[in-house]
């Protein structure tokens, strides 16, 4: 049953375009619901909260709304997300979401910036099945610079233990990496003087790992069709999905360049499962 | 271009009964709860039911439960009224819409309306 | 259910001149959730009605920013600073916080 593929090249086409806007519904010429994601710049020093905004033109009653950090490998890595009137934190606690009163307007915070939390960050909203719809915002950069010493006046300054505790580290970094570039030196002289030893060396993967073509080739994720992105990019292993009705239809998304984790197959039904009491179940009133 | 189109509506004796349709575009259907709201001509707005997304959880005001049902179909993006044992104060135009649903902040969209005429 | 009451029932006001319309609910609109679900609609002639405002103050896009809504638990106001003769119609009042959704009666606002 994994192994079915659905015809669903739209998806995989879109998705192959690099997650440029995409939706799937009546009229494929201008995208429903177009996404802000405003500053488009944004400075802060380290430590201070960044934060963006994320805009729905117009609000549906049910949809999913993610916090995307562009990889420098042009993937989303999903942050946060907001589902049915519920937050949900991504792994890293420090990345939040929070909507707004008018329900239109999402804050993306990121708490007490790092300097490798730099980079283009982006919101994406996914109206859902059975015409399942994605839309992206513009991309948005953040610059987190490193904190300026201050003048006694202002605040305090940090203690000057703590410039020599980040010299440390460096140092630290550099010698672990001129470590390991030396190892894999050696290991290549190793292999360059007794070929022999390696020749008959032979590699064999598992029957559940996927099957690569070349060197380039792309690994391939079936999804059903309407879990697009719902989970987080994490290779850890997943328990088995409950088996998804027959009429499930899939959707093979490949995505380029990516590493390939097993279990990443999710069913609709999963989508339902990952969702608290969706408003659809409960009485005539819930949460705004 | 976001558009409600509803039809169905027909002059129809006491007691008979109707479908309405409301066919959406332009937008995401099945990401709305819908509503059905009508109006007795030059006389003010009265909720009818609505139906949320899935499609299983339905509500309807005291003066037509049990006679009407409403429904949708995703996959058409249509929504659905079938009204039973009609009678003469069930005379309206009837209006599909959007945003019109308890503690919902979702856009409001409203079609032109379709009109139903009891009398025998 | 909840009985939504507007008034006045017509008003007749200049061009550039401000408009207020009243509406109260026989009980609170305020929600657990602690926002009060209170929309208002504008019906033009002839035409369907049209969402203004949503929880009381947050206006729909497209919505000029001459009108603008307020209150709290069962007493809410819209009000438009500067009418004109395009903000002819009936306006309502409608209640969000409790199934069944009610409306009030409706307000005619007409341009002098």
């Known amino acids: 049953m994994g192994s079915r593929r659905g015809p669903w090249p739209l998806v995989w086409a879109v998705l192959q375009l690099g997650w440029w806007p995409g939706w799937l519904l009546d009229s494929p010429d201008r995208p429903w619901s177009p996404l802000t994601f405003s500053p488009a710049q944004l400075t802060v020093q380290e430590g201070e909260n960044a934060t963006f905004t994320c805009s729905l033109a117009d609000i549906p009653d049910s949809f999913v709304l993610n916090w995307y950090r562009l990889s420098p490998r042009n993937q989303t890595d999903k942050l946060a997300a907001f589902q049915e009137d519920r937050i949900e934190p991504g792994r890293d606690r420090r990345f939040r979401v929070t909507r707004l009163p008018n329900g239109r307007d999402f804050h993306m915070s990121i708490v007490a910036a790092r300097l490798n939390d730099s980079g283009i960050y982006l919101c994406g909203a996914i109206y859902l099945p059975p015409n399942t719809q994605i839309n992206e915002s513009p991309r948005a950069e953040l610059s987190v610079t490193e904190r300026t010493l201050e003048p006694p006046t202002q605040s305090p300054s940090p203690p000057p233990r703590l410039s020599g505790q980040l010299q440390g580290l460096v140092i630290g970094v550099t010698s672990v990496l001129v470590g390991v570039l030396l190892l894999l030196l050696l290991t290549w002289v190793l292999a360059a003087v007794f070929p022999r030893a390696t020749r008959g060396a032979c590699v064999c993967g598992s029957e559940d790992e996927p099957l690569k073509e070349g060197p380039d080739a792309a690994p391939v994720f079936t999804l059903d069709y309407g879990e697009l992105d719902f989970q987080w990019r994490e290779k850890t292993p997943e328990p088995p999905a409950p088996c998804a009705p027959e009429q499930t239809e899939y959707a093979t998304i490949v995505f380029p360049g990516r590493p390939a984790s097993p279990g990443r197959r999710a069913s609709a039904s999963s989508l339902q499962g990952a969702q608290p009491p969706s408003p659809e179940d409960g009485p005539g009133l819930w949460p705004p | 271009q976001v558009q409600l189109v509803e039809s169905g509506g027909d002059l129809v004796k006491p007691g008979g009964s109707l479908r309405l349709s409301c066919v959406a575009s332009?937008?995401?259907?099945?990401?709305?709860?819908m509503t059905w709201v009508r109006q007795v001509p030059g006389m003010g707005l009265q909720w009818v039911a609505y139906?949320?997304?899935?499609?299983?959880?339905?509500s309807y005001a005291d003066a037509v439960k049990g006679r009407f049902t409403i429904s949708r179909d995703n996959a058409k993006n249509t929504l659905y009224l079938h009204m039973n044992s009609l009678r003469a104060e069930d005379t309206a135009l009837y209006y599909c819409?959007?945003?019109?649903?308890?503690?919902?902040?979702?856009?409001?969209?409203w079609g032109q309306g379709t009109l139903v005429t009891v009398s025998s | 259910d909840i009985v939504m009451t507007q008034t006045p029932l017509s008003l007749s006001v200049s061009p550039g001149e401000p408009a207020s319309i009243s509406c109260k609910a026989s009980?609170?609109?305020?929600?657990?959730?602690?926002?009060?679900?209170l929309y208002w609609f504008r019906q033009k002639p002839g035409q369907s009605p049209q969402r203004l405002v949503y929880?009381?103050?947050y206006r729909d896009p497209g919505v000029p920013d001459r009108f603008s809504g307020s209150g709290s638990g069962t007493d809410f106001t819209l009000r438009i600073s500067r009418v004109e003769a395009d903000d002819a119609g009936v306006y309502y009042c409608?209640?969000?916080?409790?199934?069944?959704?009610?409306f009030g009666q409706g307000t005619k606002l007409e341009i002098k």
């Open positions: 929880k009381v103050v």
């Open positions: 332009g937008f995401p259907f099945s990401s709305f709860h």
């Open positions: 409608g209640q969000g916080i409790k199934d069944p959704f009610t």
């Open positions: 819409a959007t945003g019109v649903v308890p503690t919902t902040v979702a856009s409001s969209y």
């Open positions: 009980q609170s609109l305020l929600h657990s959730s602690g926002y009060t679900y």
């Open positions: 139906v949320k997304t899935g499609g299983s959880s339905t």
